[in-house]
Interface confidence: medium
């Protein structure tokens, strides 16, 4: 496999826009949810105040074959400065509680909305 040339880039998305787009995608997931999200798959709960973006990705990346969260997984991969692979838990320092993907998405959405309201686009 040879990969020459990255995806076309119209310019960097400002952090505030990137965060808003992620929030919109999570809203979309929660509103369109009919059957249990990702067949009720369980993921590790994360500390939403500690290196949240990589931790969220490290948790969600272990869910495969769930088209509903594929875009979220892609978006989060751009929010994390290091490459994340399934089974990697470098940011998930504490792995003690598993929750359903649907609950994980709701918790993440609430936290991101709070950050957005407070203008924390870091």
């Amino acid at each position: 496999l040879t990969c020459l040339g990255g995806f076309a880039s119209p310019g960097p998305v400002p952090p505030s826009t990137a965060l808003r787009e992620l929030i919109e995608e999570l809203v979309n997931i929660t509103q369109n949810q009919k059957a249990p999200l990702c067949n009720g798959s369980m993921v590790w709960s994360i500390n939403l105040t500690a290196g949240m973006y990589c931790a969220a990705l490290e948790s969600l990346i272990n869910v495969s074959g769930c088209s509903a969260i594929e875009k979220t997984q892609r978006m989060l991969s751009g929010f994390c400065p290091h490459k994340v692979s399934a089974g990697q838990f470098s940011s998930l320092h504490v792995r003690d509680t598993k929750i359903e993907v649907a609950q994980f998405v709701k918790d993440l959405l609430l936290h991101l909305k709070k950050l957005f309201r407070e203008g924390q686009f870091n």
Partner: antibody, heavy 118, light 109 residues
Framework: EVQLVQSGAEVLKPGATVLISCKVS????????MHWVQQAPGKGLEWMGR????????KYAPKFHDRVTITADTSTDTAYMELSSLRSEDTAVYYC???????????WGQGTLVTVSS | QAVVTQEPSLTVSPGGTVTLTCRSS?????????ANWFQQKPGQAPRTLIY???NRAPWTPARFSGSLLGGKAALTLSGAQPEDEAEYYC?????????FGTGTKVTVL
């Protein structure tokens, strides 16, 4: 042993384009993001962008996004950084550097000096 | 775009303690900025000291530590050695790009 070996120094005229290569060994290039950093003489460090060599997805710094293109050739384990429309203030050392959680920016190329002069 | 500011220069006595800070123009630095600290000596590539706010690289001496202090990222050098004289840079991640700090020249005198 992990190594990042960059192409040699370049002297170019304003308006030209430079292409710098970064050949990696000791690991598979698709396993980690590759970042590029600029350092002008006597100045600080500037992040230019990064690539996921696995799928070619890139992120660029706002300052450089309209002039920089970062690519990767997985068949030769080589990353590239192309900077176009060169001006005198682009005279700098350019570094490629590997990033992963357990060793962010732990491995650096030796640097490539680009001199832009008419 | 955010601006990341550091003290231009700091002087520390051998064996003394000095704290370098890294301020973000957009507000408080958090763990989601994945703060990195680098040391650079003349003619050399930068070397990572601290990553992810407070994790030491394997080669980083225990006298260097990273933290969050009053809304800023901080690098504390306790028990300074002559070989610690160098330029120090921080880098903060802003959701989809890094920004390096302006750099601090540390003199051990």
């Amino acid at each position: 042993e992990v190594q990042l070996v960059q192409s040699g120094a370049e002297v170019l005229k304003p308006g030209a384009t430079v292409l710098i290569s970064c050949k990696v060994s000791g690991y598979t290039i698709t396993d980690y993001y590759m970042h590029w950093v600029q350092q002008a003489p006597g100045k600080g460090l500037e992040w230019m962008g990064r690539i996921d060599p696995e799928d070619g997805e890139t992120k660029y710094a706002p300052k450089f996004h309209d002039r920089v293109t970062i690519t990767a050739d997985t068949s030769t384990d080589t990353a590239y950084m192309e900077l176009s429309s060169l001006r005198s203030e682009d005279t700098a050392v350019y570094y490629c550097t590997r990033y992963d959680y357990y060793g962010p920016f732990a491995y650096w190329g030796q640097g490539t000096l680009v001199t832009v002069s008419s | 775009q955010a601006v990341v500011t550091q003290e231009p220069s700091l002087t520390v006595s051998p064996g003394g303690t000095v704290t370098l800070t890294c301020r973000s123009s957009t507000g408080a630095v958090t763990t989601s900025n994945y703060a990195n600290w680098f040391q650079q000596k003349p003619g050399q590539a930068p070397r990572t000291l601290i990553y992810g706010t407070n994790n030491r690289a394997p080669w980083t001496p225990a006298r260097f530590s990273g933290s969050l202090l009053g809304g800023k990222a901080a690098l504390t050098l306790s028990g300074a050695q002559p070989e610690d004289e160098a330029e120090y840079y921080c880098a903060l991640w802003y959701i989809n790009h890094f920004i390096f700090g302006t750099g601090t020249k540390v003199t051990v005198l």
